[in-house]
Interface confidence: low
């Protein structure tokens, strides 16, 4: 009842303010009444808050539990080790950019950019990916040559199906090579990196689809699509991994007004996939072979396949004419890795179950930021870690495998009461020696409780202090794996722990 009365007061006060404005009352009078209205609305808001506030994370976001974080760290570790193995440096950029920096770089996806409310100064947007900020960084610092990786969160105002590992806030892991080099060598290395990472993560069988923007544009041209509509037709073609050709054709003809026979010509091309032999076949195609762009793209793909064979990954790569990644900035080779679901019946082709990594060449992006339009050729890849986290988590749940959420090597425990001081001294010695150690925060914990915690936490070792052991100058060291218990001299304890946990010498 109180709330209903308050709502009525707000309505009446609102009407009163509108009336004053229509009567052209003095600014002071209107301001006074607006202040009253705002106070009433604030009361209403507080009241609403008490009733309706639900504790949750915003739509499209999630918290990471220690278990999930442990999985994530392992995945990142595999990725970073690979990036470093290939000689990449690391950079970071702000989580928000000037709105102008991101404007006009993402084509139809631009509507998914988060704009920040104007704070009376610069117009800002949350970064949508790591590639455009990288191009801005290159242009701003006048860099023409760098091999870098960048792991950070990006933001998209999507309507994501979070169950399928898609979010509004998510991590991207990017590796890019900027600079003028001989054709297809950096591009081949990017594909090699993609294959190395996906193999190391052991998330299942995968396939990397490869195409070239120039082949797509050439194909659209010879099929009779007007230049102005290449991009919108591209976004239809890119859906072929999710829906049938019939549905794609219906969208192109029905929604996007493409002539049916133009759509059919496109269909003849985009339903083809294969290896280097398909590249060679298309180089002989009576229509495509007359298109300069398509011929350039096909020539580069032919060279790319030569390098992929040398890298030993050609069996993982498929030239797929339906690959038409949505982002506007790609100019050359484009690629996308999909996890394969093995066929249910013999003779069927494996099914792709979603993109887990992607990338391509974007030679024009840096030029968009350079005042003189100077171009820096770039090629890169992005690992879809959120999908990978989901896959790894599901796999761990299915196997009921225990995931350690800490790196503690040893628990310092005591067998009798009144040994807190000794535990504190010992744990401090271990920390100073660079050993990861813990103790229970109780003066006189029961030994059984300490051992129970040690086992549940999966800590490899427990160092037990007892009165007799103190007199003898030893510590009992017990292993969780073997259940064996040995007496170790106090001065040898650090070395013994290191030996048993294979930890190299390091101090903090």
């Amino acid at each position: 009842a109180d709330r209903a009365a308050l709502e009525e007061l707000v309505r009446l006060q609102g009407a009163h303010v509108r009336g004053l404005k229509e009567q052209k009352a003095s600014a002071e009078q209107i301001e006074e009444e607006v202040t009253k209205l705002l106070k009433l609305k604030a009361q209403l808001g507080q009241d609403e808050g008490k009733q309706k506030f639900v504790l949750k994370t915003p739509k499209g976001t999630r918290d990471y539990s220690p278990r999930q974080m442990a999985v994530r760290e392992k995945v990142f570790d595999v990725i970073i080790r690979c990036f470093k193995r290939h000689g990449a440096e690391v950079i970071d950029t702000p989580v928000f950019e000037l709105k102008e920096t991101l404007t006009g770089k993402y084509g139809e996806d631009s509507k998914l950019i988060y704009d920040l409310k104007d704070q009376g100064g610069e117009l800002l947007s949350l970064r949508y990916d790591l590639t455009v900020p990288f191009a801005r960084y290159l242009a701003m610092n006048k860099l023409t040559n760098i091999k870098r990786y960048h792991i950070a969160k990006v933001y998209r105002r999507d309507n994501p199906a979070m169950t399928r590992g898609r979010y509004r806030e998510f991590y991207q892991c990017d590796f890019d090579i900027a600079g003028q080099f001989d054709p297809m060598i950096p591009d081949a290395e990017c594909l090699k990196i993609m294959c190395e990472i996906l193999s190391s993560l052991q998330i299942g069988n995968f396939l990397v689809k490869v195409n070239d923007r120039r082949i797509l544009d050439g194909m659209f041209a010879v099929c009779g699509v007007p230049d102005s509509k290449f991009r919108t037709i591209c976004s239809s073609v890119d859906k072929l991994d999710k829906v049938s050709w019939e549905e794609v054709k219906n969208e192109m003809v029905g929604e996007k007004g493409l002539a049916p026979e133009v759509a059919d010509r496109i269909g003849d091309y985009v339903q083809q996939h294969g290896g280097v032999s398909l590249v060679e076949q298309l180089l002989q195609d009576p229509k495509l072979s007359q298109n300069k762009q398509a011929v350039e793209g096909l020539g580069d793909l032919k060279l790319l396949f030569e390098y992929l064979i040398l890298f030993g990954i050609d069996d993982k790569i498929s030239f797929d004419l339906s690959l038409a990644r949505g982002l506007d900035y790609y100019t050359g080779v484009i690629y996308e890795a999909v996890l394969l679901q093995m066929p249910t019946q013999a003779g069927e082709e494996p099914l792709g179950v979603g993109s887990i990594a992607a990338g391509g060449r974007y030679d024009g992006l840096v030029g968009m930021f350079d005042p003189k339009g100077r171009k820096v050729p770039c090629v890169g890849l992005s690992i879809g870690v959120e999908r990978i986290f989901s896959i790894v988590e599901q796999r761990l749940e299915a196997s009921e495998e225990k995931v350690r959420t800490t790196e503690t090597q040893v628990l310092v425990a005591s067998a009798q009461k009144k040994l807190l001081e000794e535990r504190l001294k010992l744990v401090s010695e271990l920390w100073d020696a660079g050993i990861k150690a813990e103790l229970l925060y109780k003066k006189n914990p029961k030994l059984l409780n300490q051992l129970q915690y040690w086992e549940e936490a999966g800590i490899p070792l427990v160092a037990i202090i007892g009165e007799q052991e103190l007199r003898d100058g030893v510590i009992k060291l017990r292993s969780v794996a073997s259940r064996e218990e040995v007496d170790v001299r106090r001065e040898d304890l650090v070395e013994e722990i290191r030996r048993r946990t294979n930890q190299p010498l390091s101090t903090c």
Partner: antibody, heavy 122, light 110 residues
Framework: QVQLVQSGAEVKKPGASVKVSCKAS????????IGWIRQAPGQGLEWMGD????????NDNEKFKDRATMTADTSTSTAYMELSSLRSEDTAVYYC???????????????WGQGTLVTVSS | DIVMTQSPDSLAVSLGERATINCQSQ?????????MHWYQQKPGQPPKLLIK???NLESGVPDRFSGSGSGTDFTLTISSLQAEDVATYYC?????????FGGGTKVEIK
């Protein structure tokens, strides 16, 4: 029935801006594009660009790219065309017209507004 | 931009007689569709779509109006001119951005 109702005539000084509105009714606003066409006195038709309110997709005539801004407010089913840095040769009747289909590749314009006369004079 | 050349600039035809207007451009066709449309504009009024895709009569348009042609050459024909057909007729394509129109043909009664 389908109707496009445009805002009234405007007189502007050179260098100023004008914003013409086009309120649509009788159909689902987000299902069709709205094009803008102008006609100088005694002259032919000149297409300026269009906007597809369903996804704010725009096509522009390069000639007007830096001066014409097309927007749409889906809550009121109204399309707007703003032309800046006006000059005397911008004096014309400005029409909005409905494209046959949203994001249509090659749409004919099947319904037209009544036109808005914009006079640019010092 | 595609240039549309309309001819003649003006045309005087007796009531009940045939009127023919031509429009020439670079190709605005594919093998299935011709992206050429015809519009009628009466003095003081906005244009009105008469024929779309070269030959498809818009609903509500009298069948004395017809369109033909493909590729680069298109024709609008009024088989039996009526008094209410006095207007300026424009061809316009929607093949690529920007759409462009012909210069118009003014049809009068002789």
């Amino acid at each position: 029935q389908v109707q496009l109702v445009q805002s009234g005539a405007e007189v502007k000084k050179p260098g100023a801006s004008v914003k013409v509105s086009c309120k649509a009714s009788g159909y689902t606003f987000t299902d069709y594009c709205i094009g803008w066409i102008r006609q100088a006195p005694g002259q032919g038709l000149e297409w300026m660009g269009d906007i597809c309110p369903g996804d704010t997709y725009t096509n522009d005539n390069e000639k007007f790219k830096d001066r014409a801004t097309m927007t749409a407010d889906t809550s009121t089913s109204t399309a707007y065309m703003e032309l800046s840095s006006l000059r005397s040769e911008d004096t014309a009747v400005y029409y909005c017209a409905r494209g046959e289909e949203q994001l249509g590749l090659r749409n004919a314009m099947d319904y037209w507004g009544q036109g808005t006369l914009v006079t640019v004079s010092s | 931009d595609i240039v549309m050349t309309q001819s003649p600039d003006s045309l005087a035809v007796s009531l009940g007689e045939r009127a023919t207007i031509n429009c020439q451009s670079q190709s605005v066709s594919t093998s299935t569709y011709n992206y050429m449309h015809w519009y009628q504009q009466k003095p003081g009024q906005p244009p009105k779509l008469l024929i779309k895709y070269a030959s498809n009569l818009e609903s509500g348009v009298p069948d004395r109006f017809s369109g033909s042609g493909s590729g680069t050459d298109f024709t609008l024909t009024i088989s039996s001119l009526q008094a209410e057909d006095v207007a300026t007729y424009y061809c316009g394509h929607s093949y690529e951005i920007p759409w462009t129109f012909g210069g118009g043909t003014k049809v009068e009664i002789k």
